[in-house]
């Protein structure tokens, strides 16, 4: 007799989820010597323990603490790049500027990037059919709680000048409901962080507007200033040229506005 299974509104667990997490862990620890001590089987066990046999709308940050402990990693606090709704360019940037880091350049971010997962209450099964959607079902689901937890810790670790890449093509360049707007902004530590610098990435070839004057950027500036952190903003009119100039700042074409 088939067992009744809760139908959620979101896509189910990514296929081959356990194998993917384990393989990513092995790959990451091979590439990053400072994480060679990590036992990937223990990491997977801790990851699994955070959501297996638990109701997927009842997950807490506490559930992820064993995983957080195993994945503890020291990233240079002054070389952190946050991003919102522009992940691909942020990752292209840290591939070029190898000494700067997005969350997905850390072990835990790398493990979970682009994956979905959830379990079921009282069974050890992984649900490959459906998982809760943040809006339609519940916010305390395994994926959302994971990203909230690691994002908070990442922001708390930041110091000096923190950079954030924002998508200038969106109607809300700064969105209070994004992970950046709802978690990271509020967890930067004013006693450690002097400046938050926003890079607003332009989409259109002929777009010469100053998007740093956008009302949502002004809202971000207000939130940051109230937290006693300086705010600065830079338009990146030509993201392709920007990446080129990051790669080679002495290039003659980099003497004009990027």
């Amino acid at each position: 007799v088939p067992r009744w299974r809760q139908q959620w509104s979101g896509p189910g667990t990514t296929k081959r989820f356990p194998e993917t997490v384990l393989a990513r862990c092995v790959k990451y620890t091979e590439i990053h010597p400072e994480m060679r001590h990590v036992d990937c089987q223990s990491v997977w066990d801790a990851f699994k323990g955070a959501f297996i046999s638990k109701h997927p709308c009842n997950i807490t940050e506490e559930d992820y603490q064993p995983l957080m402990k195993l994945g503890t990693q020291t990233v240079p606090c002054n070389k952190i790049l946050l991003w919102s709704r522009i992940k691909d360019l942020a990752h292209q940037f840290t591939q070029v500027q190898r000494d700067m880091f997005t969350l997905e350049d850390t072990l835990l971010g790398y493990l979970a990037d682009d994956l979905t997962w959830c379990g079921e209450f009282n069974t050890s099964k992984i649900n490959y059919q459906s998982c809760p959607d943040w809006r339609k079902d519940c916010s305390n689901n395994p994926v959302s709680v994971f990203w909230k937890t690691v994002s908070r810790r990442f922001a708390e670790a930041a110091c000096d000048v923190v950079h954030v890449m924002l998508n200038g093509s969106r109607s809300k360049i700064f969105d209070k409901n994004s992970t950046f707007g709802s978690v990271e902004v509020h967890n930067l530590q004013p006693e450690k962080v002097q400046t938050l610098e926003a890079w607003v990435i332009h989409g259109g070839r002929e777009d010469s507007r100053d998007l740093c004057q956008d009302p949502t950027i002004k809202e971000l500036e207000s939130i940051i200033s109230k937290r006693n952190i300086q705010f600065s903003c830079k338009n990146i009119y030509r993201p392709d040229k920007f990446l080129q100039c990051v790669k080679n700042p002495e290039d003659s074409s980099c003497t004009s506005e990027i």
């Epitope: 002054n78 000096d160 000048v161 610098e197 100039c245 700042p249």
Partner: nanobody, 123 residues
Framework: EVQLLESGGGLVQAGASLRLSCAAS????????MGWFCQAPGKGREFVAG???????LYADSVKGRFTISRDNAKNMVYLQMNSLAPEDTAVYFC?????????????????WGQGTQVTVSS
């Protein structure tokens, strides 16, 4: 050949101001992070202030609110405005440039250095 040349140092009374200048030549520093460091007798080089390619600034806690870093990309110049100087600010001040765009406190991460300019603050 890349050269950084500092000027503007001198002997001043406590409470006075000085403006240090750094002239860069040999390449464009528009997209480089620039920094000021100081070295007191018998000590290592310490970060004072820095500015990234975009203009965002970073200061040592000891100078925050007293010193201001600025740059003029058209002239390839970097400045350090020093106000409310105290005897503890006495040191040789060095201008430094990175071949990267982002400011950092670590002297090891700067690629080019000037010869330094002496600042002496008497009480």
């Amino acid at each position: 050949e890349v050269q950084l040349l500092e000027s503007g140092g001198g002997l001043v009374q406590a409470g006075a101001s000085l403006r240090l200048s750094c002239a860069a030549s040999g390449r464009t520093f528009r997209n480089s992070a620039m920094g000021w460091f100081c070295q007191a007798p018998g000590k290592g080089r310490e970060f004072v202030a820095g500015m990234s390619w975009s203009g965002s600034t970073l200061y040592a806690d000891s100078v925050k609110g007293r010193f201001t870093i600025s740059r003029d990309n058209a002239k390839n110049m970097v400045y350090l405005q020093m106000n409310s100087l105290a005897p503890e600010d006495t040191a040789v001040y060095f201008c430094a440039a990175r071949s990267r765009m982002f400011v950092t406190r670590s002297p090891d991460e700067y690629d080019y250095w000037g010869q330094g300019t002496q600042v002496t603050v008497s009480s």
